[in-house]
């Protein structure tokens, strides 16, 4: 059965900057990766970044910069001043459309007694829709 | 047909402000994003930002970022730049552009908006 | 910042020629690539997106190609209206790029 994971690091430099690393488990090929915050996509939760493998990288403040890390994996940085910045119980979700398995979607937020700039290993996150 | 009508040219002092607007026709304006371009007389395409009407999300090219607001206005399907602590640097041709989240990028562009600062 | 470089600022040709502007990206952007044409006092218009991709009414003389760093667009049989500037855009990741431009001149 395919995952997907979440990792929520805050950045030990600015303290309300938030790193996002998302990664699906499964054999098929990925045809786009959306992360958003406050719930999943589409269930009350805003879109922050749209990954397309060949189309390129969409992405909203306070996105500040999107990025394939592997062919199966994401990184989002999010700045963290302004009225829209993230805060230390904010969720973040990662969908994952692949073929052949559908659409695979996982939440996670920052661990609750994390230091700055330390995370939790990532782990699979509780899927919590898979279409 | 798609249109994107750009009001008309503008001539500012330093310091000063402007607001260039993008009215557009023929489409359904919050399904698509508005893109904004800088050309300097005689030079290349710089992009400036982008917005989302449908959703409000906005992403500035951090060169701009500290000078530009960009807005929309769903109720008149019109999109918005406004350049604050305008310097000579910032005389040019600004452009919007209709684009697709991941697709059609740029497909359609307004006629272009003169901005010239002189004392 | 993705850097994509035209380096033929000029290209002199003569009608019925077939003329090829390249551009090269600093890095990979896979195929997300536009190319657009501007004529003198105009605005620019979309010719090609994801690298090969013609835009409804581009007339099939125009032709993209290329993926990864290095693309092309081919226009055949030059026509006297094809005179005009010619620009690249990476749509990989923001900020969106462009080239500096590639002017065609009709001998």
């Known amino acids: 059965t395919p995952e997907v994971w979440v990792q929520v690091r805050m950045e030990a430099t600015e303290l309300s900057s938030f790193t996002i690393r998302c990664g699906f488990l499964g054999s098929g090929s990925i045809s786009l990766v959306t992360v958003s915050w406050g719930g999943p996509n589409g269930a009350g939760g805003t879109t922050l970044a749209v990954l397309h493998p060949e189309r390129g990288i969409r992405q909203w403040a306070p996105a500040r910069q999107a990025r394939w890390e592997t062919q199966s994996s994401i990184s989002l940085i999010l700045e963290g001043s302004g009225a829209s910045s993230p805060c230390a119980n904010t969720t973040f979700c990662c969908k994952f459309a692949s073929f052949p398995e559908g659409s695979w979607e996982a939440c996670g937020s920052l661990p609750p007694s994390s230091d700055p700039g330390l995370s939790a290993p990532p782990t699979p996150a509780p899927i919590l829709r898979a279409d | 047909q798609v249109q994107l009508q750009q009001s008309g040219a503008e001539l500012v002092r330093p310091g000063a402000s402007v607001k260039v607007s993008c009215k557009t026709s023929?489409?359904?304006?919050?399904?698509?994003?508005i893109e904004w371009v800088k050309q300097r007389p005689g030079q290349g395409l710089e992009w400036i930002g982008v917005i989302n009407p449908g959703s409000g999300g906005i992403y500035y090219n951090d060169k701009f970022k500290v000078k530009t607001t960009l807005t929309a206005d769903k109720s008149s399907s019109t999109a918005y730049m406004q350049l604050s602590s305008l310097t000579s640097d910032d005389s040019a041709v600004y452009f919007c552009?209709?684009?697709?989240?991941?697709?059609?990028?740029?497909?359609?562009w307004g006629q272009g908006t003169l901005v010239t600062v002189s004392a | 910042d993705i850097v994509m470089t035209q380096s033929q600022k000029f290209i002199s040709t003569s009608v019925g020629d077939r003329v090829s502007i390249t551009c090269k990206a600093s890095q990979s952007v896979r195929i997300a690539v536009a190319w657009f044409q501007q004529k003198p006092g105009q605005s620019p218009k979309a010719l090609i997106y994801?690298?090969?991709t013609r835009h409804t009414g581009v007339p099939d003389r125009f032709t993209g190609s290329g993926s990864g760093t290095d693309f092309t667009l081919t226009i055949s049989n030059v026509q006297s209206e094809d005179l005009a500037d010619y620009f690249c855009?990476?749509?990989?990741?923001?900020?969106?790029?462009f080239g500096g431009g590639t002017k065609l001149e009709i001998k």
């Open positions: 855009l990476q749509h990989w990741n923001y900020p969106y790029t």
């Open positions: 023929g489409y359904a304006f919050t399904n698509y994003l």
């Open positions: 994801l690298a090969s």
């Open positions: 552009a209709r684009s697709e989240t991941h697709d059609t990028w740029f497909a359609y």
